[in-house]
């Protein structure tokens, strides 16, 4: 039995479709491409004859159509009017005419999305962030990416308007990174450019290293004190130490050579971000003693946290 | 006390190189970063980039890439910064200084700076 | 790259004059910002970080303000010493930019 195949189904407004005959009968020698259901005069797009090749258009003819010995018929540059059903008409010897109706849908084109936000630098557990797809396109379905991943699931999460808007609620650092919209038809998909999204913490409770083992040795005078205060932060913190209350410098690691029983006492990181409004640090008692035993802190560290 | 001395001023050709040092002494050297500051006659200040001396990472601004390299030898406290293909508009007087602390701090020590002239 | 964009870009004031330069960054800088003063000849000097904290040994006739974009620097009452280009910088993160400066003089 004759059928039409259309390739693509689905079409993307601009591209091109083909539409394939198949099980042609043996006996022809012509055949009629028409727009829509039924063999009209009117709606004829074009002829062709096969004896001659001798392809001839019809009334329907928009100068798009290209019909092939093999009875198959390419409309290029497709637009949306071109949705519907088409009909073709092969020609036989005997004169028993056979009919076959395909059809195919044109979607429009999809614009490249783009994703405007209410807040790419948005603080941990203070804020929520909305992005929003753009533009608004009928009858197109809207995805969401993060890091080149489909969304996870997260009750944090919000899809809303159709799904053109992603709400992060009171974000968290693990929400950092590139997200991406896409917008799909049947016929074809688009994908916006990534926008990143920053997300500001800490700074966290500090740590000082080297962790001294066990936590209530002390250290040999004579010996080099070298603390390491670190927290994570984003932006990265600004360090700065107090020893027993004094400021002193404003670097991540404090270094005193040759320590005395002068340098005893409170030895405190503080950490601040300006851009979450917070600080945060930790003390740590050292005590130096004049003769042999292991070196090491003291074990009374605490620490403190202010918003 | 904090000092940073640089090396003297130079004279070049354009194509050539430069190699400007900067000694420090007064803290620990390898506790704080060294950026490099630029400043054409009658003009602005340009940051260049900087070294940590702890690593000897560097980060450069976008318009020096392929053409500085900042390098430091911690036996001398001196960081260099060498700047090639150097054009007429290069003339200007390079600032070392040091960061006031670690991470997003301003520089709070300078050198006396060094005058680079780029003349055929 | 942010951009740094001082006003004005000179101002003559009196001895005793209340004096504001402004500064306004392209991006939200959250009071990561720096000023300098330049002297004629003489190398940058840092008066203010995190866009009020005055470096020790500043007088406290300077002063700076702002926050996310928008920052000021003032001199409650200009000095003769006070002559020089004042530059402002952000130091959130690299690469760090200045403005183009603010010439300073005495009427």
């Known amino acids: 039995k004759l059928t039409i195949e259309s390739t693509p189904f689905n079409v993307a407004e601009g591209k091109e479709v083909l539409l394939l005959a198949h099980n042609l009968p043996q006996n022809r020698i012509g055949y009629s491409w028409y727009k829509g259901e039924r063999v009209d005069g009117n709606s004829l797009i074009v002829g062709y004859v096969i004896g001659t090749q001798q392809a001839t258009p019809g009334p329907a003819y928009s100068g798009r159509e290209t019909i092939y010995p093999n009875a198959s018929l390419l409309i290029q540059n497709v637009t949306q009017n071109d949705t519907g059903f088409y009909t073709l008409q092969v020609i036989k010897s005997d004169l028993v005419n056979e009919e076959a109706t395909g059809q195919f849908h044109v979607y429009p084109e999809l614009p490249k999305p783009s994703i405007s936000s209410n807040n790419s630098n948005p603080v941990e557990d203070k804020d929520a962030v909305a992005f929003t797809c753009e533009p608004e396109v009928q009858n197109t379905t809207y995805l969401w990416w993060v890091n080149g991943q489909s969304l996870p699931v997260s009750p944090r999460l919000q899809l809303s308007n159709g799904n053109m808007t992603l709400t992060l609620l009171s974000v968290k650092r693990n929400d950092a990174g590139s997200y991406e919209c896409e917008i799909q038809n049947p016929a074809s998909a688009n994908r916006s450019d990534p926008v990143t999204l920053n997300v500001l913490y800490g700074p966290d409770v500090p740590t000082i290293s080297p962790i001294i083992s066990p936590p209530d040795s002390s250290y040999l005078s004579g010996a080099n004190l070298n603390l390491s205060c670190h927290s994570a932060s984003n932006p990265s913190p600004q360090y700065s130490w107090r020893i027993n209350g004094i400021p002193q410098q404003h670097t991540q690691v404090l270094f005193i050579a040759k320590i005395t029983p002068n340098n005893n006492g409170t030895y405190a990181c503080f950490v601040s971000n300006l851009a979450t409004g917070r600080n945060n640090s930790i003390v740590k008692s050292i005590t130096v003693s004049a003769s042999g035993t292991s070196p090491g802190l003291s074990a009374g560290a605490h620490h403190h946290h202010h918003h | 006390q904090v000092q940073l001395v640089q090396s003297g001023a130079e004279v070049k050709k354009p194509g050539a190189s430069v190699k400007v040092s900067c000694k420090a002494s007064?803290?620990?050297?390898?506790?704080?970063?060294l950026h490099w500051v630029r400043q054409a006659p009658g003009q602005g200040l340009e940051w260049i980039g900087y070294i940590n001396p702890q690593t000897g990472y560097t980060s450069y601004a976008q318009k020096f890439q392929g053409r500085v390299t900042m390098t430091r030898d911690t036996s001398t406290s001196t960081v260099y910064m060498e700047l090639s293909s150097l054009r007429s508009e290069d003339t200007a007087v390079y600032y070392c200084?040091?960061?006031?602390?670690?991470?997003?701090?301003?520089?709070?020590?300078w050198g006396q700076g060094t005058l680079v002239t780029v003349s055929s | 790259d942010i951009q740094m964009t001082q006003s004005p870009s000179s101002l003559s004031a009196s001895v005793g004059d209340r004096v504001t330069i402004t500064c306004r960054a392209s991006e939200n800088q959250y009071g990561y910002l720096a000023w300098y003063q330049q002297k004629p000849g003489k190398v940058p000097k840092l008066l203010i970080y995190?866009?009020?904290n005055l470096v020790e040994g500043v007088p406290s006739r300077f002063s700076g303000s702002g926050s996310g974009t928008d920052f000021t620097l003032t001199i409650s009452s200009l000095q003769p010493e006070d002559v020089a280009t004042y530059y402002c910088q952000h130091h959130l993160g690299t690469p760090y930019t200045f403005g183009q400066g603010t010439k300073v003089e005495i009427k």
């Open positions: 007064g803290y620990i050297f390898t506790s704080y970063y």
């Open positions: 200084a040091r960061e006031y602390g670690n991470y997003n701090y301003p520089l709070d020590y």
């Open positions: 995190n866009y009020k």
